[in-house]
Amino acid sequence: LRLLDHRALVCSQPGLNCTVKNSTCLDDSWIHPRNLTPSSPKDLQIQLHFAHTQQGDLFPVAHIEWTLQTDASILYLEGAELSVLQLNTNERLCVRFEFLSKLRHHHRRWRFTFSHFVVDPDQEYEVTVHHLPKPIPDGDPNHQSKNFLVPDCEHARMKVTTPCMSSGSLWDPNITVETLEAHQLRVSFTLWNESTHYQILLTSFPHMENHSCFEHMHHIPAPRPEEFHQRSNVTLTLRNLKGCCRHQVQIQPFFSSCLNDCLRHSATVSCPEMPDTPEPIPDYMPLW
């Protein structure tokens, strides 16, 4: 988790002098509770936006927006703590809006936005906005939270972001797999425009089961420049096991931008359809 560009972040708006500060996610009001605290944010909304860095890179960011309730507690509102928690790693990043002037009611509802938290493809986040100071112990909560999931690099709009392109999202191998005679699979895919090696991972399964009955790895050396964007054809020999008929072929590239953590592509061959054969009728009837 990080902030997009560490240029001056702005939270001031007409009628409010405000500054954005790094936060430890542990506001002082936890330790030194105040008697009078503001009410919670209203209408918290989290959206996925895309933003360019000063270097021209494109990143997905969490666009956070909320409004204030129209009650007298805004007189005690000193700022807000914005927290983003990545759910699978428990990593948290916070910033603090520090109000340098007192808020007053005006003809429009106060609205705040922040779009500088960079988020990762295929990750889920909990976004919380806490009004400051935080409430006394047992006081009514004055925060609002929402979870949101970022699409993965297969998504059309995500595909062109810098983190996705770095992991090889623009490569479309267009994998085809066909079953040949004599327990063989023919795998064909399009090479990318980089002199890097590939690995084909074959995993076979019995019909309708998820534990593998055969695994095989095949190394493909780095292509020469004249082979870029050409089709690579590989024939894999299968283990002669009856019923080990569903094959998943996964191609792992080793591009320089992502090394051994590049996006993998896969294709699956289903088991052949079994004709419905009627149960044979016994020509004698057992007596027991």
């Epitope: 996925l48 666009h63 929402k146 979870n147 949101f148 999931l149 699409p151």
Partner: nanobody, 127 residues
């Protein structure tokens, strides 16, 4: 123009099944997460289920978990809700809704994250 049209509602006996459909047009359907929301007579809106753009993530309200299944067919620009073991308390107007942005609201009150709603299809569960 951007439009969502629900169908498949009707009168059904308790314990029976129904399949709702939602046809989308006017936007790139497979870019967005979609949701089902319902409103029982005299009650407020209740989120029912959500599905991410590629069906990789599906979520359900506790009240329908194990009975309802959400699915989508991006090739047909369609969203579905398979409702099994229907109960009287499932009686409501069912709406499909599109998320405003490309993310997927996976918890918290999500209704304000939707920008396009259908006109709804009525489901009545009664013997």
């Amino acid at each position: 123009q951007v439009q969502l049209v629900e169908s498949g509602g009707g009168l059904v006996q308790p314990g029976r099944s129904l399949r709702l459909s939602c046809a989308a047009s006017g936007f790139t359907f497979d870019d967005y997460a979609m949701h089902w929301v319902r409103q029982a007579p005299g009650k407020s809106l209740e989120w029912v289920s959500g599905i991410s753009w590629n069906s990789g993530r599906k979520d359900y309200a506790d009240s329908v978990k194990g009975r309802f299944t959400i699915s989508r067919d991006n090739a047909k620009n369609s969203l579905y809700l398979q409702m099994n073991s229907l109960r009287a308390e499932d009686t409501a107007l069912y709406y499909c809704a599109k998320e405003k942005s490309l993310g997927y609201c996976s918890s918290g009150p999500c209704s304000d994250a939707f920008d396009i709603w259908g006109q709804g299809t009525m489901v009545t569960v009664s013997s």
